[in-house]
Interface confidence: low
């Protein structure tokens, strides 16, 4: 009888991650007696994938019934393929030996390549907020794809960006790859509602790219503009002074009124009005009892927005411009009346 040959008919196969891979192997003789084993790789460091003697390996099933000695088909099916399974698989015939089985003959090998989808892109922005006109960096990461070829694009509100750098790692052969890209974006005051999108296209996605997004609302800080105005007299000896806080984002804002440099009242913004661009407006006012003042009053509206250094706007209130009621100042009330925002 002719010497046994181990035949692996497929030089290479390609399988999508999550599917099963069938590795074909037949022998031409039942002699010598001995088990078939499957290995990934060659040489001393090869990895045992299946051993006829040892029975069930969790992810490996045999195509034929290997409990029968007359079986000549030693093909195996590996389930739930992952990129880590990529490599060259060898079907190896062993001859019974003592104390160890002796390798008799190996097949030529079948190279298994795995097509793996990239993970959903994750876009992250800067750790701290930035103000309009500043340039901020966004990163996009996707992992676990194979083969290595991949395309990444950046968009801001649907418009493709060009200022970005992309790396695919590792540079050499690997079971799977990762992509990392950094894009630079110039913020504008209108960006509260803007989105930055990272789009990844890969052969495994069949023309339906994956997208990751970041909302610029998480990144931008639009500082407020302040305007302090004196309203017409609402009652005898009372003046209404308002502080308009306009076009700010995010909402977190604290306002302090000062009278000649002394704190009169501090309040936290509530009942904000939202502008179409996503920024907010707020107004606070004071009722000033001018009869309680002999001299002019400097009123200051001081605003601390989103933990940033305070900005302020002042208004000089001319006391002399208001007539005083005779005999009404013998027991004056508080100089500044507390007022709720509109």
């Amino acid at each position: 009888e002719e010497e046994l040959q181990v035949i692996q008919p497929d030089k290479s196969i390609s399988v999508a991650a999550g599917e099963s891979a069938t590795l074909h192997c037949t022998v031409t003789s039942l002699i010598p007696v001995g088990p078939i084993q499957w290995f990934r790789g060659a040489g001393p460091g090869r990895e045992l994938i299946y051993n006829q003697k040892e029975g069930h390996f969790p992810r490996v099933t045999t195509v034929s019934d290997l409990t029968k000695r007359n079986n000549m088909d030693f093909s195996i099916r590996i389930s739930n393929i992952t990129p880590a399974d990529a490599g060259t698989y060898y079907c190896v015939k062993f001859r019974k030996g003592s104390p160890d089985d002796v390798e008799f003959k190996s097949g030529a090998g079948t190279e298994l390549s795995v097509r793996a989808k990239p993970s959903a892109p994750v876009v992250s922005g800067p750790a701290a907020r930035a103000t309009p006109q500043h340039t901020v960096s966004f990163t996009c990461e996707s992992h676990g794809f194979s083969p290595r070829d991949i395309t990444l694009k950046w968009f801001k509100n649907g418009n493709e960006l060009s200022d970005f750098q992309t790396n695919v790692d590792p540079a050499g052969d690997s079971v799977s790859y990762s992509i990392h890209s950094t894009a630079k974006v110039v913020l504008t005051r209108e960006d509260v509602h803007s989105q930055v999108i990272c789009e990844v296209a890969h052969v495994t996605l069949q023309g339906d790219p994956l997208r990751g997004t970041a909302n610029l609302s998480e990144t931008i800080r639009v500082p407020p503009t302040l305007e302090v105005t004196q309203q017409p007299v609402r009652a005898e000896n009372q003046v209404n002074v308002t502080c308009q806080v306009r076009k700010f984002y995010p909402q977190r804002l604290q306002l302090t009124w000062l009278e000649n440099g002394n704190v009169s009242r501090t309040e936290t913004a509530s009942t904000l009005t939202e502008n179409k661009d996503g920024t907010y407006n707020w107004m606070s006012w004071l009722l000033v009892n001018v009869s309680a003042h002999r001299d002019d009053v400097k009123l200051t509206c001081q605003v601390e927005h989103d933990g940033q250094p305070a900005v302020s706007k002042s208004h000089d209130l001319k006391v002399s411009a208001h007539p005083k009621e005779q005999g009404s100042n013998t027991a004056p009330g508080p100089a500044l009346a507390s007022a709720a925002p509109l």
């Epitope: 003697k53 029975g55 029968k68 000695r69 019974k96």
Partner: antibody, heavy 118, light 107 residues
């Protein structure tokens, strides 16, 4: 020296449970399939269970659903958990190593006696 | 299940004799056959595996042969320590099964 030592046998009432242990030494335990074989007094040998190195298990119909086999490679130990015991399970229980490429039983322990009686 | 039938059930022989014990399987077991020796109160000892392969440390006076369904164990020259009960076992298909045993006694 390659050695297998069983323990855990004893007298148990019908319907009861018993857990047998087999301590292995002198070889790389995790690299071998392991077996339990029993022998009623004055009678022949009966295969009871096999556990492969990958944890795959096999039983004859006579004990399936009542016996479980397990192994703890880190402790070089083999176990046989026997539940719903019957008088017909009375026997000497041996553990054995599947030591050859084709899983022939090459090394046997000295055995432990299990008696099921009320 | 595969049935294993040994013959004879018992055998009387003298020291120096050559004896043969046979084992028949109810279906082809593809040479997955082992032979064991057991002495009273002792554990079985492996003699032969894969029908004809001698287990390490077993004297060459023991030999096995056969294929398919019919197998034999031969002891070429009996010694006093060889008087025991001998079992065959198939391990081709679960459940593994043993023959009923052959008791070899001194004549």
């Amino acid at each position: 020296e390659v050695q297998l030592v069983e323990s855990g046998g004893g007298l148990v009432q019908p319907g009861g449970s018993l857990r047998l242990s087999c301590a292995a030494s002198g070889f790389t335990f995790s690299s071998f399939d392991m077996h339990w074989v029993r022998q009623p007094t004055g009678k022949g040998l009966e295969w009871v269970s096999t556990i492969g190195i990958a944890g795959d298990t096999y039983f004859p119909g006579s004990v399936k659903g009542r016996f479980t086999i397990s192994r703890e490679n880190a402790k070089n130990s083999l176990y046989l958990q026997m539940n719903s015991l019957r008088a017909g399970d009375t026997a000497v229980y041996y553990c054995a190593r599947g030591g050859n490429w084709d899983d022939a039983l090459d090394i046997w322990g000295q055995g432990t006696m299990v008696t099921v009686s009320s | 299940d595969i049935q294993m039938t040994q013959s004879p059930s018992s055998l009387s022989a003298s020291v120096g004799d050559r004896v043969t014990i046979t084992c028949r399987a109810s279906q082809d077991i593809n040479n997955y056959l082992a032979w064991f020796q057991q002495k009273p109160g002792k554990a079985p000892k492996s003699l032969i595996y894969t029908a004809s392969s001698l287990q390490s440390g077993v004297p060459s006076k023991f030999s096995g042969s056969g294929s398919g369904t019919d197998f034999t164990l031969t002891i070429s020259s009996l010694q006093p320590e060889d008087f025991a009960t001998y079992y065959c076992q198939q391990y081709n298909t679960y459940p593994y099964t043993f023959g009923q045993g052959t008791k070899l006694e001194i004549k």
